[in-house]
């Protein structure tokens, strides 16, 4: 009679974490009499996974009725697979005796475990940056297996190329992590922009995971200022407006100075939003020119999002017919309020 062979038909089996793995094993003969044992690994450090004869193996069930006398199928199912279960499993026939002796081993089945990556988390810089500056975004995803993974960066649907990616650890592990850093150049139009990190892995079946960051949390668009003198509203009254345009975020404080003295301070409230997500705001002063003997230098000083103040000035000619002029000046800080000046914003 032909000698017993132990057949493990599957060279490899791949299972998703949490699922059950079926490991097939059949023998070609009922002789010699003796139990089957399953091991992870071979050699002196092999681990017993299942013993047909004795023992308690709560995660292992037999696929067929292995207790039947004529049974030759010794396939097993291992439940709730984790990445730590990866390895080569051997079905081993023993010859009955005292003790039982190893008779023949199958060729082994390599079990690999697939584990999904966690949702990518994208984080940007701690401090805001202005247009034309380059900022870094990081993307992290964890817990996946096998190690092979693809990560891409996008800005508003356009793929980015300036990034560096590492998968850790470099050696073998039950699961892996990916970390990527992308560099993004900000533009004034980026308030509504998004940076997207996309992770593709064999476990995701072609449906990649995405993590996003809104550039609105990263960008600061400084305002442009324009101070203009409006036509005379009434006798001896001049309306001066300060147009604060294209700024983001909304946090802004405006101070009017008359000849360097603080006249009024207000906080931007009823702003208008532009299509690109930036804001506009206007503040005005009603100046009673009859109260002044000399020309008046009016300065609109804006502190945006905690940054150093920027200002724009306008010279109001008291002696002659008012004419419009504008010049940038450094912020002035003298502190008296001037009467006969009225203001508002819109």
């Amino acid at each position: 009679e032909e000698e017993l062979q132990v057949i493990q038909p599957d060279k490899s089996v791949s299972v998703a974490a949490g699922e059950s793995a079926i490991l097939h094993c059949t023998v070609t003969s009922l002789i010699p009499v003796g139990p089957i044992q399953w091991f992870r690994g071979a050699g002196p450090a092999r681990e017993l996974i299942y013993n047909q004869k004795e023992g308690h193996f709560p995660r292992v069930t037999t696929v067929s009725e292995s207790t039947k006398r004529e049974n030759m199928d010794f396939s097993i199912s291992i439940s709730n697979i984790t990445p730590a279960d990866a390895g080569t499993y051997y079905c081993v026939k023993f010859r009955k005796g005292s003790p039982d002796t190893e008779f023949k081993s199958g060729a082994g089945t390599e079990l690999s475990v697939r584990a999904k990556p966690s949702a990518p988390v994208v984080s940007g810089p701690a401090a805001r940056a202005t247009p034309q500056h380059t900022v870094s975004f990081t993307c992290e995803s964890h817990g996946f297996s096998p190690r092979d993974i693809t990560l891409k960066w996008f800005k508003n649907g356009n793929e980015l190329s300036d990034f560096q990616t590492n998968v850790d650890p470099v050696g073998e592990s039950v699961s892996y992590s990916i970390h990527s850093t992308a560099k993004v150049v900000l533009t004034r139009e980026d308030v509504h922009s998004q940076v997207i990190c996309e992770v593709a892995h064999v476990t995701l079946q072609g449906d990649p995971l995405r993590g996003t960051a809104n550039l609105s949390e990263t960008i600061r668009v400084p305002p442009t200022l324009e101070v203009t003198q409006q036509p005379v509203r009434a006798e001896n009254q001049v309306n001066v407006t300060c147009q604060v345009r294209k700024f983001y975020p909304q946090r802004l404080q405006l101070t009017w100075l008359e000849n360097g003295n603080v006249s009024r301070t207000e906080t931007a409230s009823t702003v208008t939003e532009n299509k690109d997500g930036t804001y506009n705001w206007m503040s005005w002063l009603l100046v009673n020119v009859s109260a002044h003997r000399d020309d008046v230098k009016l300065t609109c000083q804006v502190e945006h999002d905690g940054q150093p103040a920027v200002s724009k000035s306008h010279d109001l000619k008291v002696s002659a017919h008012p004419k419009e002029q504008g010049s940038n000046t450094a912020a002035e800080n003298t502190g008296s309020n001037e009467r006969n000046i009225y203001g508002g914003s819109g």
Partner: antibody, heavy 122, light 112 residues
């Protein structure tokens, strides 16, 4: 192709601890035994011990009380530490890969490092 | 521990001629699964050992077919059918049945 590279100090003082690392490149650590073997000058080979991918270790009883082998799969490395060295521990130290797929025994030490010479001297 | 004894200690050879090395173990290396857990290694001068034969008679990858292993139980033999100059070095047998793994004392093969 799998390659092994030993690293560590070439000179160790008597009574101190010998520490060597073997870096595995070009292959998997899984399903193999990772062995340390030494060869004193002009003498034969002596098996010191090995570690399996599951962390189980086996040591030569003649050295057991002094030897520890550890495995860092994440770095693709395994290490040897031997305490209380004497001049008799002067040898070429090899790291090696041992195959296992035929039951209880082993199927050959098929990959060897180039060896590193360790001299124990004050 | 299993004691491995090799003979001869030294073996002068003539290129093109056959050569044979004996290895005896203090207990049987033939396991109940039918495998004889014995390896043969060659250590060329100044080099690391290399695996020639495993499980008593299986040639390792890349080993020329002039090398063959035989034997069972406690008596094993390595044969070189036609010695070549590159075959010089020290040959070791090693039992791989149980720990501690143990080597024979070595047989030095040199050209006459």
């Amino acid at each position: 192709q799998v390659q092994l590279q030993e690293s560590g100090p070439g000179l160790v003082r008597p009574s101190e601890t010998l520490s060597l690392t073997c870096t595995v490149s070009g292959g998997s650590i899984r399903n193999y035994y990772w062995s340390w073997i030494r060869q004193p000058p002009g003498k034969g080979l002596e098996w010191m011990g090995f570690i399996y991918d599951n962390g189980r270790t086996f040591y030569n009883p003649s050295l057991k009380s002094r030897v520890t082998i550890s495995l860092d799969m994440s770095m693709n490395q395994f290490s040897l530490k031997m305490t209380s060295v004497t001049a008799a521990d002067t040898a070429v130290y090899y790291c090696a890969r041992v195959r296992a797929y035929s039951g209880i025994g082993l199927d050959g030490t098929d990959v060897w490092g180039q060896g590193t010479t360790v001299t124990v001297s004050s | 521990d299993i004691v491995m004894t090799q003979s001869p200690l030294s073996l002068p050879v003539t290129p093109g001629e056959p050569a044979s090395i004996s290895c005896k173990s203090s207990q049987s290396l033939l396991y109940s699964n039918g495998y004889a857990y014995l390896d043969w290694y060659l250590q060329r001068p100044g080099q690391s050992p290399q695996l020639l034969i495993y499980l008593g008679s299986n040639r390792a990858s890349g080993v020329p077919d002039r090398f063959s292993g035989s034997g069972s139980g406690t008596d094993f033999t390595l044969k070189i059918s036609r010695v070549e100059a590159e075959d010089v070095g020290v040959y070791y047998c090693m039992q791989a049945l149980q720990t501690p793994l143990t080597f024979g004392g070595g047989t030095k093969v040199e050209i006459k």
